[in-house]
Every structure is written in C-alpha cells, then in structure tokens.
C-alpha cells in the first residue's frame, strides 16, 4: 500500500549489524509524487567500490546509488548525511554485509516521505501539445482557442471534421486557408452524392502547399482521397504533386488531411463536382451498339444487337438483342450477355438415314445426311447437305429447314434370280432375290411389300383373316426361322371396293378385282433380304405385251409338296387371256362357263409346267422396269388358275395404281409423312 | 444323309431309371421338332413323346406323362428322353423320329418323316 | 384325346390287287394325319402326310384321301414290297395317336 512517508534502519539499529545479512525495502509512495529519500546515520564497513558491506538503492532498473562507510552533515542545521531525489513513485533499497566485520559497524537509518514532481518541466518528453499545468501529485492539459482536447487528455487539434457534402458542385479548403492549417490534427471531410454520379476533384497546383515529405519520402502532413476501395495520395509539398482532375468512379469520397505538431504550411484548396457515372464503350464482339456515342454516362439505355449468326443465349432461350443500361456503379447491366455464334444444335436424326456427328454446330457449320444405301434414298432431294443458318437452323438450299427424307428403293433384289428348276416347274430361290417376298401363314400365302407401311396382296387372301400374320426376310418358312425373321402386324386391311365378297368362298368363279392392300402397324426396316417393289408407271410403257417375261415366286404346292419349306420362283411368259380360258379347271366347284375373265386379269406360263399354284396366291409377278432395267414393279398378283402347271391369272396391278395410291394417301399417319 | 442313331436302351429293374440319347446329323437339326415312339414285342407303334424345334413346347402320352420327361440340346444336335419309374409295360423299341413345323403364329406340323433304327428298352426283376 | 379306330386289322391280298385301308377318328382331325408303312425288324416310313399328299419318293400307287373323321390309304395295284403292316396317325393335337395297324399279307 503506497505510503506518503517511511523510516528504514539496518537490522538491530543502532546496534552492530550482522554478518552475512541481506535485506531489502520496497519504497512505494502514491502516483503523480516523486521520493526523497535522505539518510541520517550512516556507519558501514568501507571496502572499495562498496564491495563489502552496502546500501543500494535502485529505481525501476536503475542504481540510483550505493553507499558504505561513515557520513556526518556537511549542514550544522540539518541531519542529512546523504539524499536523494527520485520523479517516480517507487524506489528499492538493498543493505548486504558480508561474512566478517573487523570491527563494529552500526548500520544506517534512512527516512523517505513523498514529493510532488513537475511534469510540465521535469522530464525531457513534454506531456502535452499546447499548454501544461502542474498540480500536486499531477498535471494536466489545455488547449488555445479553437483547440480542443484530444481524448488522449495530452493532444490539442482543430475540430475539422464532421463536414458532409452533398451537393452536386462545392469548394472545400484546409482549416485557416489560405493562413496555416492547425499542426497536430485529423481533418474529414465526407462527398456523398447520388448514386450514379462520380466525385470528380479538381485544384490547381498553386493552391496547394503542405508540408514536405521526409528523407524517406514519407509526407509528414499529408491529403488523401478514398473512394470505395480506391485510394488517391497521400500528398505534400509545396505545389499539388497529383492530377489536376480526379475522377473518383465513385459517388462517395472521402478527404483526410492528417497534419503533424511542426511545420505549417498554408494549406490547401479544391474544388469538386458531380459527373454522371460514366459506363466503358466496351468491344462486345458480333454486335452492334444502338445509339452509338462516343461516351454513355449513367442512365443511358442502348440495345445492343447481335450480326446475323450470333445469338444472346440467356438461359434456354435465344434472342437477338439486349438491352443494356449504364448502371450508378459505371457498370452496365447485362453485362454478362454476349453475341455467341448462333448454336444449331446437334442435327435431329431422321429414319433410315444417318448424319456424322458434326465437328461443331455453331453458325456456318455444314452437315451431311445420307440415306442407308443401298435400301434408301434421299426422295425429297437437295443433296442432303445443311449447313448452320443464322436463325439457329440446319437449312439446305433445296428443302430450307425441312429435314431429308429416306425412302426405301423398290424393286431393286440383292442378288439376281438364277433358274435351277421347282413354286410348278420352278426353281429354289433366296430371299435376297425377292426381297419383297411377304409370308402370310394363316391361310398359307404370299403378299408384296411396296413400302415401309404397306403391303399388296390378293383380296382373296385377306378376305377370310382381316388381321394376318405376315413375316419378312425369310427363305425358309419353317417355324424356327420365321421365328428369328421380321414378323410383321396389321394395323387394317383394305380390300378392293370391286371384290365381290360371297358366304361362300370356296365356290367363287369371279376373281375380278381380286387385289387388296395391308396397312402395317410399325414401319418396314429395309435391308438385304427386306425391300419393296415397285408400283407400275401409269403411261403405256407399262402395259405387258404376250411375251413378256415375269418372275414369281412363293411358298406355294410344288409337285412334290402340298407347301414348299424354302422359297420358289419361276420365269413366265405373259400369254393372251384366251390360253387360260382354254384350259380345263382342275376340280371345278362351278360349270366351267361360269368362271370370269376381265381385262383387269393377266395370263401367264404354259412353259416348261411353270406356273404358281395353292399357297401362291398374293405374291407378285414382278416384270423388269422398262424404264429402269435394275428395277422390278409388281405387274400381276398370284390371282387364280385353272390348273396347276399350266396357265395361272394374275390381277393387273397397272389397272389399280389410282386406288392404291389414294389408299396409301388417305390412310397415312404423321408419322410416315 | 440325313440320320438318327439311338442310344441308352438296357435292361432295368422296375421303378428304375434309364435316360435314352437320339444323335441327329444331315440336316440343321435346330430346325426341326422331334418325337418318340415307341413299339412293344409283337405291338403297334405308340407315340411316347414330342418336342419343338427350341424345346419351349412339349406333349407326353397320358401313359408316361409325369414320369419321362423329353429335352434336346441343339448345340449337341441331340434329343433326349429321360425315363424314372419305370414298369414292365414300358418295355419296347424306342424310335426316334424327326418332325417338321411350317409357318409362323398358325402352325403346319409334318410328323415323323423320317426314323431311327431304335433302341431296345427292357424293363424286368 | 383323340382316338384312331383302324380297320381292318389284317388283310390277304394278292400282287396286283387294289387295297384300301381306312382310318376314322373319334373327332374332326381336318386333314390333319399321316400314313405309315412297317416291315418286319424295320422302322417306319411315312407314305402320305396331310392326309392326301404322297411323300416324295413313295410309288403314285399309293394314294391318301379323305379329311374330318374319315381317312382312307388306297394301293391301286399290291407290289410284292407292299406286303407290310400300315399305320394312321392323327396329328391334330396332343396327344398323337397312331391307329392299331393293318397287317397287309400274301394270299
């Protein structure tokens, strides 16, 4: 506990001290006192620097001295053989004797009691700024006027700070302008104008004049400007060592001037004014600014465009244009938005054809579709090539955006037909020589394939079964082989308006107009063994001279079979109608008069006993294309005959392209068209 | 040359097992259905068993019917009948006998064109 | 189950002879059976298939006819190879059954 007065005597005052003693006092007397200490008595053995025997005395780390020996008063009026003065409050005092004494030595008494100190004067740091006044047991300090009083209790500055302004144009200036600024203050002065506005200070170099920097190029007073996250300073000296004009960028700013307690200068003055948040003219490239000027500041809309072939992409959704404003941050909007190349997507895939995947999709891009040769082609034309349009479509220059469309080639077989001998006289074929060949097993018969949708047969064929099983791509009929073929399912059947349809079918004698056609459920995929016939022209090319040679084939009777297991086909001439009216019906269910021969049936055979027979019925008598000798068309349908081996009738196909056309048309989904 | 050559027949006690092989070679035998017949000393032929060309279908006698049990493996060109619980009244020439089956949905069945020399099955204690 | 009644069950005939064999089945088998020829420690052969069709290799002096119930195998002219016994057999559906046989003999 400090105390403001203390007595301190060596062990067994007035007495001998004794050996091998250390003691020491801890002197403590109340803050803002310094400490006298003086000593009365003093008899300690004497040895060269104290080294024996002493007193010590020590301020904070300082030997403020150490004493042996003897001491009288220099004063007849005063006690005091040794003194000292302290300016802190406390203070340690050290007696040590060592091991022997050669005579006795009675010690010390020492008293101490509390000063008051001069803070104004006695120590080497001034306390205050300004003006410092000494009170017992402490000091404190003022200001001159228009000073005040730093929180720190020692420090004097102007009140220069607070300031805030507004509005759009001002001056502001240093304390005291164009007289000396106050030494030792902190002045901030705050610009707060509307958003999209920038600060934009100017002053001239004469109206600066601040103190100069140090050695280390450190200013000593200094202005400096913050905006935002920029910083513009700090500067000194005598001229303004910045630019003239600084624009801020920001619609804040924020003016320190910081000066030291030395060197006044007389200050500083600016001026400052508001401009519109200017936005860049940036470079968005494949675009186009509207209007174009030459600076946008704040609030100024332009719509930027984007060149034919290039697109904003926001989202999912593509646009041509944007529009962009110049935004209170000097930023535009949308600024994000840029012209990409326009993407055409990945090409849509179309049937039966394909497209290579593109090295890119974006605008200009080309791409090509081909059909799967050789089962298809390109019917709508064009060349198949697209190219990426501007308007993010794949165009080509025939068809514009409207996709190819792959349709099987008809009447084209794999491999040529060669004769070896079986259908009546016929011989064993593959598939691939009759790739349009269809297998209707309920009741046993053939049909042809003339497109992915449809098949031609006769009517007789489907009149009692209106949803037939139909298989594809098979030369062998046996069960295990049509199971691992194309079957294929009946959407409707349509028999010719023509055929007479009986209660009793067995007993028919009139196969005129005996033609039908089957709409399939799924489209026909063509290939080697799969692939329709073609339908004959309507010009008079196509009508069959007495003569002209046809390919048939089937499963039908042979003269070995009542069904043949692998496929049939023979070469017939076409005969005049007369030499099937000649021959004799086999079992017939009716006198032979009453069976009917129009001109809508062809006759054919009485060569070698080829002819088509039982199980036959539906299937093509295909007849080379005049007008393309690759091609087959379907001329006839196995019809009926009077014997098997002889002569057989066959529907004329010509007589019926209108009606199977416009079955075809009128029955059409979406999905083939 | 199309052929079927049986194998497996025996003398067996009755309740015994006996399991009969039929090898077939000349022609693609998964093509075809298969059945067996059999003919007792001094009897008539009675139809034992058939078969589908890919063993999805098959038919017994009621004489047999839980008791044999017809497979083939058409990697093996081969045709099996499978015989538990026999009796004395199975005892008989087992043939084999291929079958032909025309059309898709709506079958043609050809029955046993052609035949095996068989294979003697005995059953006795 | 179908069943196949086979009459006669043996007949003598003499080389030249015509021979007819018939077959009725318990119900309408269409003409959905077969015919067959056995020789004494032979397997059979198939003669007609589809009731009426000859198998090809067969002589044309055999001949099938018939569909529904009634079913006849006619040999317009007995060879001396034709001595043997012949079955029917209905095919129309599980279980197949073969008719008990005719026993054709030299008179």
């Known amino acids: 506990e400090p105390t403001m007065y203390g007595e301190i005597l060596s062990p067994n005052y007035p007495q001998a001290y004794p050996s091998e003693v250390e003691k020491s006092w801890d002197i403590e007397v109340p803050e803002g006192y310094g400490i006298h200490l003086y000593f009365t008595h003093l008899d300690i053995e004497l040895s060269e620097n104290c080294a024996y025997d002493s007193v010590q005395i020590i301020s904070g780390d300082t030997e403020e001295g150490r004493l042996c020996g003897q001491r009288s008063s220099n004063n007849p009026h005063s006690p005091i053989v040794e003194e000292f003065q302290v300016p802190y409050n406390k203070l340690q005092v050290i007696f040590k004797s060592d091991f022997s004494n050669e005579e006795r030595f009675t010690g010390f008494a020492a008293y101490y009691v509390a000063t008051d100190i001069n803070e104004c004067t006695d120590f080497v740091d001034v306390p205050c700024s300004h003006f410092c006044n000494n009170f017992i047991g402490g000091y404190f300090c003022s200001c001159p006027p228009e000073y005040f009083l730093h929180d720190d209790m020692k420090n004097c500055g102007v009140n220069c700070s607070g300031d805030v302004f507004t509005a759009l144009i001002g001056e502001i200036a240093s304390p005291n302008y164009p007289k000396p600024y106050p030494e030792n203050s902190r002045c901030e002065y705050q610009i707060r104008l509307e958003k999209g506005f920038q600060v934009v200070v100017t002053l001239r170099r004469e109206d600066f004049d601040v103190e100069a920097a140090d050695s280390a190029g450190n200013c000593l007073d200094s202005l400096v400007f913050v905006a935002g996250d920029r910083q513009f300073g700090p500067y000194c000296g005598h001229g303004f060592p910045g630019p003239l004009n600084i624009e801020t960028k920001s619609n804040a700013l924020d003016i320190i001037f910081q000066t030291d307690l030395t060197g006044q200068k007389k200050g500083w003055k600016l001026r400052y004014h508001g401009d519109p948040m200017p936005c860049p003219k940036e470079d968005t490239p494949n675009s186009v600014w509207e209007p174009a000027k030459a600076k946008y500041v704040f609030r100024d809309v332009v719509q930027i465009t984007c060149l034919d072939g290039f697109e904003v992409v926001e989202g999912r959704v593509g646009a041509t244009s944007f529009y962009s404003t110049c935004q209170s941050n000097g930023k535009w909007s949308n600024s994000k938005l840029k012209c990409q190349p326009v993407d055409c997507g990945i090409p849509e895939s179309i049937e039966n054809g394909k497209v290579e995947d593109p090295e890119s999709t974006l605008f200009g891009s080309v791409i090509r579709y081909t059909c799967e040769e050789p089962y298809y082609y390109m019917e709508n034309g064009g060349g198949g090539e697209y190219h990426c349009a501007g308007n993010g479509s794949w165009v080509n220059e025939v068809l514009g955006p409207e996709l190819p469309k792959c349709v099987p080639v008809c009447g084209v077989p794999r491999e040529p037909f060669e004769e070896k001998q079986r259908i009546i006289g016929g011989s064993d074929a593959d598939i691939k020589n009759f790739p349009w060949q269809v297998f209707f097993d309920n009741p046993w018969a053939g049909g042809a394939l003339i497109n992915e949708y449809w098949v031609l047969t006769a009517a007789h064929v489907v009149e009692g079964n209106r949803e037939p099983t139909m298989y594809v791509g098979s030369t062998s009929v046996q069960t295990s082989r049509l199971a691992k073929s194309k079957m294929l399912t009946p959407e409707h059947v349509f028999i010719h308006p023509g055929w007479k349809l009986l209660e009793v079918p067995e007993g028919r004698t009139n196969f005129d107009n005996d033609i039908a056609l089957v709409r399939l459920k799924d489209p026909v995929k063509m290939g080697p063994t799969v692939s329709p016939i073609c339908l004959p022209g309507t010009s008079s090319d196509y009508n069959l001279m007495d003569g002209d040679l046809g390919l048939i084939s089937g499963w039908g009777r042979t003269e070995k079979r009542d069904r043949a297991v692998r496929l049939k086909a023979a070469r017939l001439p076409v005969a005049p109608l007369r030499k099937c009216k000649e021959v004799k019906v086999e079992k017939p269910t009716a006198d032979a008069e009453a069976y009917v021969f129009t001109p809508n049936m062809i006759c054919a055979g009485g060569e070698k006993g080829m002819d088509s027979c039982k199980g036959d019925s539906g299937g093509a008598f295909a007849v080379q294309d005049p007008n393309d000798k690759t091609k087959f068309y379907a001329a006839g349908l196995v019809s009926w005959g009077p014997q098997c081996g002889t002569y057989g009738l066959y529907t004329r196909v010509k007589n019926y392209v209108d009606w199977i056309m416009k079955t075809m048309q009128e029955n059409s989904t979406p999905r083939e068209d | 040359e199309v052929q079927l050559v049986e194998s497996g027949g025996g003398v067996v006690r009755p309740g015994g097992s006996l399991r009969l092989s039929c090898a077939a070679s000349?022609?693609?035998?998964?093509?075809?259905?298969m059945s067996w017949v059999r003919q007792a000393p001094g009897k008539g032929l009675e139809w034992v068993s058939g078969?589908?060309?890919?063993?999805?279908?098959?038919g017994y006698a009621d004489s047999v019917k839980g008791r044999f049990s017809i497979s083939r493996d058409n990697a093996k060109n081969s045709l099996y009948l499978q015989m538990n619980s026999l009796r004395a009244e199975d005892t008989a020439l087992y043939y084999c006998?291929?079958?032909?089956?025309?059309?898709?949905?709506?079958?043609?069945?050809?029955?046993?064109?052609?035949w095996g020399k068989g294979t003697t099955v005995t059953v006795s204690s | 189950d179908i069943q196949m009644t086979q009459s006669p069950s043996s007949l003598s005939a003499s080389v030249g002879d015509r021979v007819t064999i018939t077959c009725r089945a318990s119900?309408?088998?269409?003409?959905?059976l077969g015919w067959y020829q056995q020789k004494p420690g032979k397997a059979p052969k198939r003669l007609i298939y589809?009731?009426?069709n000859l198998q090809s290799g067969v002589p044309s002096r055999f001949s099938g006819s018939g569909s529904g119930t009634e079913f006849t195998l006619t040999i317009s002219s007995l060879q001396p190879e034709d001595f043997a016994t012949y079955y029917c057999?209905?095919?129309?559906?599980?279980?197949?059954?073969f008719g008990g046989g005719t026993k054709v003999e030299i008179k």
């Open positions: 006998a291929r079958d032909e089956q025309l059309g898709g949905l709506k079958y043609y069945y050809y029955y046993m064109d052609v």
């Open positions: 000349g022609f693609t035998f998964d093509d075809y259905g």
């Open positions: 078969i589908n060309w890919e063993g999805g279908s098959t």
């Open positions: 119900q309408g088998i269409r003409n959905d």
């Open positions: 589809t009731a009426s």
């Open positions: 057999l209905q095919y129309h559906s599980y279980p197949l059954r």
